[in-house]
């Protein structure tokens, strides 16, 4: 079993990067003298007790930032946040930390990432950019839900 | 406010099933893990299992499996223990309890009032 | 399976600091055991105390606190008050399941 979590860069279709501003992240068109974030992801290792053929549940992290992405109601509706967590602490829990936890699924070379707190509830960018990562379950031109991501060895 | 409130007292015979409900209120089942446990008179607690709500998938411990079955009804907030196969040491108080991560931890946060279950021929 | 083995009964004075142990027969108990530690008190229902071996529940107060002692996982009251008379319950994760001693009766007096 892998126990140390892996890296990678990750961009949307429109080659749009992850960027950290005031605790936000946002995705806004690759630019040089940028510094897109470095996610880093790790397997949940209580994998038999989530739901099968979803996807592989991760933690998602900002490497090094000891940042991880979190789901949360906000009134009646599911957001998308920041929180100060180090992913190894989640990984070591004894019970998956839903909360934390992403379906990931691969088609090709496109990535999604569903909530597992929120089943239906994709990370996703406005297709106009220079927006904050969001939670939608519209899954249409409005957002943008599918991302490449890379890993880095 | 948060509360679990378990059936009432049950009297069974050797050989017989029981099922004990715990009916959740002031929050969803669904985003929580429920734990079922054990205290034989005069013993300590024995964990049983525990049970995902929002999916189903459940954990026992090796001593329970095949003795225990974990199930939940979401649309009424309510979870249920059954046993099978009733021995005069099943005898015991069983309590639900609710699992629940908050801020770094899990932690065992609410309790039902226990369910007294005797078994005697 | 493992056994986890608490003290049977402890007696503190009212305003004085005890200590409860949980120990391990598999050897010293870790982080990685993530020690719970719950409290019951006469008639009434079973209230978590400590999660993740040191962090407090929301709501516990301060003068309960969790934490790893010569190899045992270790609730300690500081400043105990009449209240605090109950039995205590600690349990331990291995791998994928959950061990809980047998429980120590607190009398404060």
């Known amino acids: 079993k892998i126990d140390t979590p892996q890296r990678g860069s990750i961009q949307d279709i429109n080659h749009r990067v992850w960027v950290l501003q005031d605790q936000t992240l946002i995705a806004v068109p690759r630019k040089d003298r940028m510094s897109p974030v470095t996610i880093a992801l790790i397997s949940c290792r209580h994998v038999e007790t989530l739901e099968k053929d979803r996807g592989n549940p991760i933690y998602l992290g900002l490497n090094g930032l000891n940042l991880c992405l979190m789901c949360a109601k906000v009134g009646d509706q599911p957001t998308l946040q920041l929180k100060e967590k180090d992913i190894m602490d989640l990984y070591n829990q004894p019970e998956p930390v839903k909360s934390f936890l992403f379906y990931h699924s691969q088609s090709g070379r496109n990535s999604t990432f569903e909530s597992v707190a929120f089943p239906g509830w994709f990370i996703a960018v406005s297709s106009e950019g220079g927006c904050p990562l969001i939670l939608t379950q519209e899954l249409g031109k409005a957002n943008t839900t599918d991302f490449g991501l890379t890993m880095l060895f | 406010q948060v509360q679990l409130v378990q059936s009432g007292a049950e009297v069974k015979k050797p050989g017989a099933s029981v099922k004990v409900s715990c009916k959740a209120s002031?929050?969803?089942?669904?985003?929580?893990?429920i734990y079922w446990v054990r205290q034989a008179p005069g013993q300590g607690l024995e964990w049983i299992g525990r049970?995902?709500?929002?999916?189903?998938?459940?954990r026992y411990d090796p001593k329970f499996q095949g003795k225990a079955t974990l199930t939940t009804d979401t649309s009424t907030n309510t979870a249920y223990l059954e046993l099978s196969s009733l021995r005069s040491e099943d005898t015991a108080v069983y309590y639900c309890?609710?699992?629940?991560?908050?801020?770094?931890?899990?932690?065992?946060?609410?309790w039902g009032q226990g369910t007294l279950v005797t078994v005697s021929s | 399976q493992a056994v986890v083995t608490q003290e049977p009964s402890l007696t503190v004075s009212p305003g004085g600091t005890v200590t409860l142990t949980c120990r391990s027969s598999t050897g010293a108990v870790t982080t990685s055991n993530y020690a719970n530690w719950v409290q019951q008190k006469p008639g009434q229902a079973f209230t978590g105390l400590i999660g993740?071996?040191?962090d407090r529940a929301p709501g516990v107060p301060a003068r309960f606190s969790g934490s790893l002692l010569g190899g045992k996982a270790a609730l300690t009251i500081s400043g105990a008050q009449p209240e605090d008379e109950a039995d205590y319950f600690c349990?331990?994760?291995?791998?994928?399941?959950?061990?809980f001693g047998g429980g120590t009766k607190l009398t404060v007096l």
């Open positions: 002031g929050f969803n089942i669904k985003d929580t893990y």
């Open positions: 349990a331990l994760w291995y791998s994928n399941h959950l061990v």
């Open positions: 049970i995902d709500p929002a999916i189903g998938t459940t």
């Open positions: 993740g071996t040191n």
């Open positions: 309890a609710r699992y629940d991560y908050s801020g770094s931890s899990f932690y065992f946060d609410y």
